[in-house]
């Protein structure tokens, strides 16, 4: 594998997702090199002239950085020596989505890997019992999603049942005119049953569970990013 006396080194990236309006991380690792001053990290984005970020000789070099990323990027400097070239991206926006390349050059050799960065919005759902309805119903709300997700209900007792006829889902555009609030109401629920509200788009899947008994209401929520790794 020798090229000019240098070898290829293994660089590994993970498809990752950024939640717009938050800081995000583009993950990249490489074979560690104890000589920090000999490590060069370059992040590039397909279709963008100039660099996303450059770190060399133990410090940032932003002289070639593209305007779009000015003031927004950082590597985890203290972790570079152990092979972490991940990039922190401040205030992720939809336009940050795309194909990125993590390029590494060390005293051991050089290598690169591409990363597909997806951007959107995803949030935890909250389920509450809606006592105002004529019959007992459940209201599942999640404040921020993009692209528009699908919403499905499930129940522990009636496994495999289709609840689309007894539920109503609406999407309300948020003030920044990108993300949307998701509201889904499930009607005619029965006591002593566990219901799940599942919200999913191509970036994330979130599930909210609620168990309603005569004496108490128990809730649980979880969120997972899709296509990571």
């Amino acid at each position: 594998f020798g090229i000019s006396g240098k070898h290829f080194i293994t660089v590994t990236t993970f498809t990752s997702a950024g939640n717009i309006g938050e800081d995000g991380t583009l993950s990249c690792t490489f074979e560690p090199d104890i000589k920090l001053n000999g490590i060069v990290i370059q992040w590039l984005k397909e279709g963008i002239k100039g660099l996303v970020h450059e770190f060399k000789e133990g410090k940032d070099d932003l002289s070639q950085q593209h305007e779009m990323f000015r003031g927004r990027t950082a590597v985890f400097a203290d972790q570079v020596v152990v092979g972490n070239a991940s990039l922190r991206l401040k205030n992720v926006q939809l336009t940050d989505a795309g194909t990125y390349t993590c390029y590494i050059h060390t005293s051991k050799g050089k290598g690169n890997a591409n990363l597909e960065y997806k951007t959107g919005a995803f949030s935890m759902p909250e389920i509450n019992v809606d006592y105002n309805a004529s019959s007992e119903s459940l209201r599942c709300e999640a404040p921020r999603w993009f692209p528009q997700p699908t919403v499905a209900w499930a129940s522990q007792v009636d496994q495999g049942a289709n609840f689309s006829e007894v539920s109503n889902t609406s999407f309300e555009l948020n003030s920044e005119n990108v993300t949307m609030k998701v509201v889904s109401v499930l009607y005619n629920v029965t006591i002593n049953n566990t219901y799940s509200c599942m919200i999913e788009n191509d970036i994330a899947k979130a599930t909210g569970d609620i168990k309603v008994t005569d004496s108490e209401v128990k809730r649980r929520s979880q969120l997972e990013l899709l296509n990571s790794g």
Partner: antibody, heavy 116, light 109 residues
């Protein structure tokens, strides 16, 4: 014109509560990281709280559990709810926008005095 | 927690002179996340430099920023009377999310 205008400061007794407001014009609050920064008399700047574009919040340890940052998107306004106020919370409170490259827009500040 | 230490605490210079203000971080700070502010008495701070070396909108070119890692510098090439103020460096990204230096007072000699 991009502008931030704070209000709601005043004299309050220790243990009391106060809500500061920051009205924004010329830009959309929910698209930026919005902050509260304070400055005690004769002292330097101290970061207090942030609300991200996503709506998630974070605060300095000194105010955690006592101060809550929030926003009303329909009013394009930022708030700081301050509870269990202490003498050391006496300061000028500024709201400031972080437009990805530093706190580029600041309000004129509102003074909070905690004293019995 | 990253601590930013500014030096000197007070700098006494005359108009026309060159001012060099230092900001040292207790651990490495990304150049992208380092900013400088100017504050005059009774006024809100004003952003001067972001990304360690980029001038904010409307800032005269006599102001320049440099440095990386743990050592950053704000330079005012030729002092004007309106430049006498307090200057703060600030970093973003660790806990607490925003940290300011204690400030350097630039006063007329």
């Amino acid at each position: 014109e991009v502008q931030l205008v704070e209000s709601g400061g005043g004299l309050i007794q220790p243990g009391g509560s106060l809500r500061l407001s920051c009205a924004a014009s010329g830009f959309i609050v929910s698209r930026n990281y919005m902050n509260w920064v304070r400055q005690a008399p004769g002292k330097g700047l101290e970061w207090v709280s942030v609300i991200y574009g996503s709506g998630r919040t974070d605060s300095a340890d000194s105010v955690k559990g006592r101060f809550t940052i929030s926003r009303d998107n329909s009013k394009n306004t930022l708030y700081l709810q301050m509870n269990s106020l202490r003498a050391e919370d006496t300061a000028v409170y500024y709201c400031a926008r972080d437009a990805d490259y530093g706190l580029d827009v600041w309000g004129q500040g509102t003074t909070v005095t905690v004293s019995s | 927690e990253i601590v930013l230490t500014q030096s000197p605490g007070t700098l006494s210079l005359s108009p026309g002179e060159r001012a060099t203000l230092s900001c040292r971080a207790s651990q490495s700070v990304s150049s992208s996340y380092l900013a400088w502010y100017q504050q005059k008495p009774g006024q809100a701070p004003r952003l001067l430099i972001y990304g360690a070396s980029s001038r904010a909108t409307g800032i005269p070119d006599r102001f320049s920023g440099s440095g990386s890692g743990t050592d950053f510098t704000l330079t005012i090439s030729r002092l004007e009377p309106e430049d006498f103020a307090v200057y703060y460096c600030q970093q973003y990204g660790s806990s607490p999310l925003y940290t300011f230096g204690q400030g350097t007072k630039l006063e007329i000699k």
